[in-house]
Protein backbone atom coordinates (compact mmCIF):
# COMPACT_ATOMS: atom_id res chain seq x y z
CA UNK A 1 0.00 0.00 0.00
CA UNK A 2 2.87 2.36 0.87
CA UNK A 3 4.69 1.45 -2.34
CA UNK A 4 1.50 1.92 -4.34
CA UNK A 5 0.89 5.43 -2.98
CA UNK A 6 4.56 6.34 -3.56
CA UNK A 7 4.28 5.17 -7.19
CA UNK A 8 1.08 7.16 -7.71
CA UNK A 9 2.79 10.30 -6.33
CA UNK A 10 5.79 9.66 -8.55
CA UNK A 11 3.66 9.27 -11.68
CA UNK A 12 1.79 12.44 -10.77
CA UNK A 13 5.06 14.39 -10.54
CA UNK A 14 6.32 12.92 -13.81
CA UNK A 15 3.10 14.02 -15.48
CA UNK A 16 3.34 17.47 -13.93
CA UNK A 17 6.93 17.97 -15.12
CA UNK A 18 6.26 16.55 -18.59
CA UNK A 19 5.33 19.97 -19.95
CA UNK A 20 8.87 21.19 -19.18
CA UNK A 21 10.85 18.01 -19.79
CA UNK A 22 8.99 15.34 -21.80
CA UNK A 23 11.27 12.58 -20.54
CA UNK A 24 13.25 12.05 -17.34
CA UNK A 25 16.00 9.51 -16.71
CA UNK A 26 15.89 8.43 -13.06
CA UNK A 27 18.05 6.31 -10.80
CA UNK A 28 17.42 4.99 -7.32
CA UNK A 29 19.64 6.74 -4.79
CA UNK A 30 21.37 4.25 -2.49
CA UNK A 31 19.32 1.44 -1.03
CA UNK A 32 16.22 3.49 -0.34
CA UNK A 33 13.65 2.77 -3.05
CA UNK A 34 11.84 5.94 -1.96
CA UNK A 35 14.37 8.31 -3.48
CA UNK A 36 14.68 8.62 -7.23
CA UNK A 37 16.99 11.28 -8.63
CA UNK A 38 16.29 12.32 -12.18
CA UNK A 39 17.73 14.35 -15.01
CA UNK A 40 15.84 15.32 -18.14
CA UNK A 41 16.63 13.14 -21.13
CA UNK A 42 19.16 13.71 -22.76
CA UNK A 43 20.87 15.80 -20.07
CA UNK A 44 23.93 14.27 -18.38
CA UNK A 45 24.37 13.87 -14.64
CA UNK A 46 27.35 14.40 -12.34
CA UNK A 47 27.08 14.22 -8.56
CA UNK A 48 23.89 16.11 -7.59
CA UNK A 49 23.47 18.09 -10.83
CA UNK A 50 22.20 17.75 -14.39
CA UNK A 51 23.90 19.36 -17.41
CA UNK A 52 22.69 20.33 -20.88
CA UNK A 53 24.80 21.53 -23.78
CA UNK A 54 22.80 24.09 -25.73
CA UNK A 55 24.03 24.25 -29.32
CA UNK A 56 21.92 27.29 -30.26
CA UNK A 57 24.04 30.43 -30.58
CA UNK A 58 22.79 33.23 -28.33
CA UNK A 59 24.02 36.17 -26.26
CA UNK A 60 24.86 35.60 -22.58
CA UNK A 61 21.56 37.10 -21.40
CA UNK A 62 19.49 35.05 -23.83
CA UNK A 63 21.48 31.93 -22.98
CA UNK A 64 20.74 32.41 -19.28
CA UNK A 65 17.04 32.96 -20.04
CA UNK A 66 17.02 29.82 -22.18
CA UNK A 67 18.42 27.84 -19.23
CA UNK A 68 15.99 29.38 -16.74
CA UNK A 69 12.97 28.45 -18.89
CA UNK A 70 14.03 24.84 -18.28
CA UNK A 71 14.48 25.36 -14.53
CA UNK A 72 18.26 25.65 -14.86
CA UNK A 73 21.01 28.29 -15.00
CA UNK A 74 24.16 28.81 -16.98
CA UNK A 75 26.73 26.47 -15.48
CA UNK A 76 28.56 27.31 -12.26
CA UNK A 77 31.81 25.34 -12.06
CA UNK A 78 32.84 24.57 -8.50
CA UNK A 79 35.68 22.07 -8.88
CA UNK A 80 38.29 20.75 -11.33
CA UNK A 81 36.44 17.39 -11.28
CA UNK A 82 33.24 19.08 -12.37
CA UNK A 83 34.99 20.88 -15.23
CA UNK A 84 36.67 17.61 -16.29
CA UNK A 85 33.24 16.00 -16.46
CA UNK A 86 31.71 18.87 -18.45
CA UNK A 87 34.41 19.02 -21.10
CA UNK A 88 33.81 15.39 -22.08
CA UNK A 89 30.64 16.59 -23.79
CA UNK A 90 32.03 19.71 -25.50
CA UNK A 91 33.29 20.19 -29.05
CA UNK A 92 36.81 21.53 -29.40
CA UNK A 93 35.92 23.97 -32.17
CA UNK A 94 33.14 25.63 -30.13
CA UNK A 95 32.92 28.06 -27.24
CA UNK A 96 30.31 27.85 -24.48
CA UNK A 97 28.99 30.49 -22.09
CA UNK A 98 29.46 29.89 -18.38
CA UNK A 99 27.30 31.39 -15.64
CA UNK A 100 30.11 33.83 -14.85
CA UNK A 101 30.01 37.55 -15.60
CA UNK A 102 31.50 40.89 -14.59
CA UNK A 103 28.53 43.23 -15.09
CA UNK A 104 30.31 46.40 -13.93
CA UNK A 105 33.48 45.79 -15.92
CA UNK A 106 35.51 46.17 -12.72
CA UNK A 107 36.80 42.63 -12.53
CA UNK A 108 34.28 41.67 -9.85
CA UNK A 109 33.42 38.32 -11.38
CA UNK A 110 30.19 36.78 -10.12
CA UNK A 111 28.48 33.45 -10.61
CA UNK A 112 24.85 33.53 -11.67
CA UNK A 113 23.72 31.60 -8.56
CA UNK A 114 25.75 33.93 -6.30
CA UNK A 115 28.27 31.24 -5.37
CA UNK A 116 31.27 33.26 -4.11
CA UNK A 117 33.90 33.71 -6.83
CA UNK A 118 37.03 31.93 -5.62
CA UNK A 119 40.26 32.84 -7.44
CA UNK A 120 41.74 29.52 -6.30
CA UNK A 121 39.13 27.54 -8.24
CA UNK A 122 39.28 29.25 -11.61
CA UNK A 123 40.49 27.85 -14.90
CA UNK A 124 41.30 30.91 -17.01
CA UNK A 125 43.53 30.46 -20.02
CA UNK A 126 46.89 32.14 -19.46
CA UNK A 127 46.62 35.90 -19.98
CA UNK A 128 42.87 35.84 -19.35
CA UNK A 129 40.74 37.69 -18.43
CA UNK A 130 42.31 40.50 -20.42
CA UNK A 131 39.70 43.11 -21.38
CA UNK A 132 37.46 45.17 -19.10
CA UNK A 133 34.86 45.44 -21.86
CA UNK A 134 34.64 41.65 -22.13
CA UNK A 135 32.28 40.96 -19.25
CA UNK A 136 31.13 37.38 -19.82
CA UNK A 137 33.06 34.12 -19.55
CA UNK A 138 33.23 31.21 -21.95
CA UNK A 139 34.98 27.88 -21.84
CA UNK A 140 36.89 26.90 -24.97
CA UNK A 141 39.77 24.76 -26.19
CA UNK A 142 43.23 26.05 -27.00
CA UNK A 143 45.72 23.56 -28.34
CA UNK A 144 48.47 24.90 -26.09
CA UNK A 145 46.44 24.72 -22.86
CA UNK A 146 43.50 22.45 -23.59
CA UNK A 147 40.21 23.62 -22.00
CA UNK A 148 40.02 26.91 -20.12
CA UNK A 149 38.07 30.11 -19.64
CA UNK A 150 38.18 33.34 -21.63
CA UNK A 151 36.39 36.66 -21.22
CA UNK A 152 34.38 37.86 -24.24
CA UNK A 153 31.73 40.44 -25.15
CA UNK A 154 28.40 39.34 -23.71
CA UNK A 155 26.39 40.12 -26.85
CA UNK A 156 28.46 37.83 -29.09
CA UNK A 157 26.39 34.65 -29.68
CA UNK A 158 27.86 31.45 -28.29
CA UNK A 159 26.74 27.97 -27.40
CA UNK A 160 26.12 27.45 -23.68
CA UNK A 161 25.97 24.96 -20.82
CA UNK A 162 22.96 24.76 -18.50
CA UNK A 163 23.07 23.21 -15.03
CA UNK A 164 20.37 22.39 -12.52
CA UNK A 165 19.95 20.36 -9.36
CA UNK A 166 18.76 16.82 -9.92
CA UNK A 167 15.00 16.43 -9.76
CA UNK A 168 13.88 14.23 -6.90
CA UNK A 169 10.59 12.37 -7.31
Amino acid sequence: NFMYSKTVKRLSKLREYQQYHPSLTCVMEGKDIEDWSCCPTPWTSFQSSCYFISTGMQSWTKSQKNCSVMGADLVVINTREEQDFIIQNLKRNSSYFLGLSDPGGRRHWQWVDQTPYNENVTFWHSGEPNNLDERCAIINFRSSEEWGWNDIHCHVPQKSICKMKKIYI
Epitope: Y17, Y20, T61, S68, G71, V112, D113, Q114
Partner: nanobody
Protein backbone atom coordinates in the same frame (compact mmCIF):
# COMPACT_ATOMS: atom_id res chain seq x y z
CA UNK B 1 4.93 30.90 -20.18
CA UNK B 2 3.75 32.91 -17.18
CA UNK B 3 2.11 36.31 -17.35
CA UNK B 4 2.38 38.51 -14.25
CA UNK B 5 0.28 41.52 -13.26
CA UNK B 6 1.10 43.63 -10.20
CA UNK B 7 -1.40 45.80 -8.33
CA UNK B 8 -1.78 47.56 -4.99
CA UNK B 9 0.70 50.39 -5.39
CA UNK B 10 -0.10 53.99 -4.59
CA UNK B 11 0.73 57.04 -2.52
CA UNK B 12 1.11 56.48 1.22
CA UNK B 13 2.38 58.56 4.13
CA UNK B 14 5.55 57.60 6.01
CA UNK B 15 4.76 54.91 8.56
CA UNK B 16 1.84 53.66 6.48
CA UNK B 17 1.18 50.25 4.91
CA UNK B 18 0.44 48.80 1.49
CA UNK B 19 -0.14 45.29 0.23
CA UNK B 20 1.10 44.54 -3.27
CA UNK B 21 -0.36 41.65 -5.23
CA UNK B 22 1.00 39.85 -8.26
CA UNK B 23 -1.48 37.70 -10.16
CA UNK B 24 -0.04 34.98 -12.37
CA UNK B 25 -1.66 33.32 -15.35
CA UNK B 26 -0.57 30.81 -17.96
CA UNK B 27 1.54 27.99 -16.57
CA UNK B 28 1.10 26.10 -13.27
CA UNK B 29 1.83 28.79 -10.67
CA UNK B 30 2.90 26.34 -7.94
CA UNK B 31 5.89 25.23 -10.06
CA UNK B 32 7.43 28.70 -9.86
CA UNK B 33 9.57 30.40 -7.24
CA UNK B 34 8.62 34.06 -6.99
CA UNK B 35 10.41 37.29 -6.15
CA UNK B 36 9.81 41.00 -5.65
CA UNK B 37 12.25 43.62 -6.92
CA UNK B 38 12.15 47.41 -6.92
CA UNK B 39 13.68 50.23 -8.90
CA UNK B 40 13.95 53.79 -7.61
CA UNK B 41 14.41 56.63 -10.15
CA UNK B 42 17.95 56.70 -11.50
CA UNK B 43 18.94 53.52 -9.63
CA UNK B 44 19.45 49.90 -10.59
CA UNK B 45 16.71 47.37 -9.96
CA UNK B 46 17.26 45.71 -6.58
CA UNK B 47 16.07 42.53 -4.94
CA UNK B 48 13.49 42.87 -2.14
CA UNK B 49 12.12 39.43 -1.23
CA UNK B 50 11.73 35.89 -2.54
CA UNK B 51 9.60 32.85 -1.80
CA UNK B 52 9.91 29.18 -2.73
CA UNK B 53 7.22 27.42 -4.73
CA UNK B 54 5.86 25.68 -1.62
CA UNK B 55 6.07 28.88 0.48
CA UNK B 56 8.27 26.88 2.86
CA UNK B 57 11.24 29.21 2.38
CA UNK B 58 11.32 33.00 2.21
CA UNK B 59 14.07 35.58 2.15
CA UNK B 60 13.96 39.34 2.68
CA UNK B 61 16.77 41.80 2.06
CA UNK B 62 18.08 43.37 5.27
CA UNK B 63 16.70 46.84 4.54
CA UNK B 64 13.09 45.56 4.61
CA UNK B 65 13.40 42.77 7.20
CA UNK B 66 10.77 43.10 9.90
CA UNK B 67 8.76 45.56 7.80
CA UNK B 68 7.96 43.67 4.58
CA UNK B 69 6.60 40.14 4.28
CA UNK B 70 6.37 38.04 1.12
CA UNK B 71 3.69 35.35 0.91
CA UNK B 72 1.81 33.39 -1.72
CA UNK B 73 -1.51 31.68 -2.30
CA UNK B 74 -1.07 28.88 -4.81
CA UNK B 75 -4.82 28.31 -5.05
CA UNK B 76 -5.26 31.97 -6.07
CA UNK B 77 -2.15 32.04 -8.31
CA UNK B 78 -0.97 35.14 -6.45
CA UNK B 79 2.10 36.32 -4.59
CA UNK B 80 1.90 39.20 -2.11
CA UNK B 81 4.22 41.76 -0.55
CA UNK B 82 2.88 43.20 2.69
CA UNK B 83 4.73 46.46 3.34
CA UNK B 84 4.50 48.08 6.78
CA UNK B 85 6.29 51.07 8.34
CA UNK B 86 6.95 52.48 4.89
CA UNK B 87 9.69 55.10 4.56
CA UNK B 88 10.43 57.65 1.79
CA UNK B 89 13.40 55.49 0.72
CA UNK B 90 10.94 52.69 -0.16
CA UNK B 91 9.61 54.87 -2.99
CA UNK B 92 10.13 52.87 -6.19
CA UNK B 93 8.53 50.88 -8.98
CA UNK B 94 7.92 47.35 -7.63
CA UNK B 95 8.12 44.32 -9.91
CA UNK B 96 7.31 40.68 -9.34
CA UNK B 97 9.18 37.91 -11.12
CA UNK B 98 8.80 34.16 -11.61
CA UNK B 99 11.21 31.31 -12.21
CA UNK B 100 10.55 27.62 -12.83
CA UNK B 101 12.01 25.28 -10.23
CA UNK B 102 11.70 21.58 -9.47
CA UNK B 103 12.81 22.01 -5.87
CA UNK B 104 10.12 22.83 -3.31
CA UNK B 105 12.32 24.92 -1.02
CA UNK B 106 14.55 26.88 -3.40
CA UNK B 107 14.20 30.65 -3.68
CA UNK B 108 16.20 33.04 -5.86
CA UNK B 109 17.68 36.45 -5.07
CA UNK B 110 19.53 37.22 -8.33
CA UNK B 111 17.69 39.15 -11.02
CA UNK B 112 19.27 37.13 -13.83
CA UNK B 113 17.76 33.88 -12.52
CA UNK B 114 14.18 35.03 -13.09
CA UNK B 115 12.53 34.35 -16.42
CA UNK B 116 9.21 36.18 -16.33
CA UNK B 117 8.51 39.73 -15.16
CA UNK B 118 5.47 41.90 -14.60
CA UNK B 119 5.16 45.53 -15.69
CA UNK B 120 5.39 46.78 -12.11
CA UNK B 121 3.39 49.02 -9.79
CA UNK B 122 4.47 52.38 -8.39
CA UNK B 123 4.83 52.93 -4.64
CA UNK B 124 5.35 56.50 -3.43
CA UNK B 125 5.96 57.25 0.24
CA UNK B 126 5.57 60.94 0.96
CA UNK B 127 3.90 63.28 3.39
Amino acid sequence: QVQLQESGGGLVQPGGSLRLSCAASGDTFSNYAMGWFRQAPGKAREFVAAISRSAGSTYHVDSVKGRFTISRDNAMNTVYLQMNSLQPEDTAHYYCAARLTFNLIDYYTAETRYTYWGQGTQVTVSS
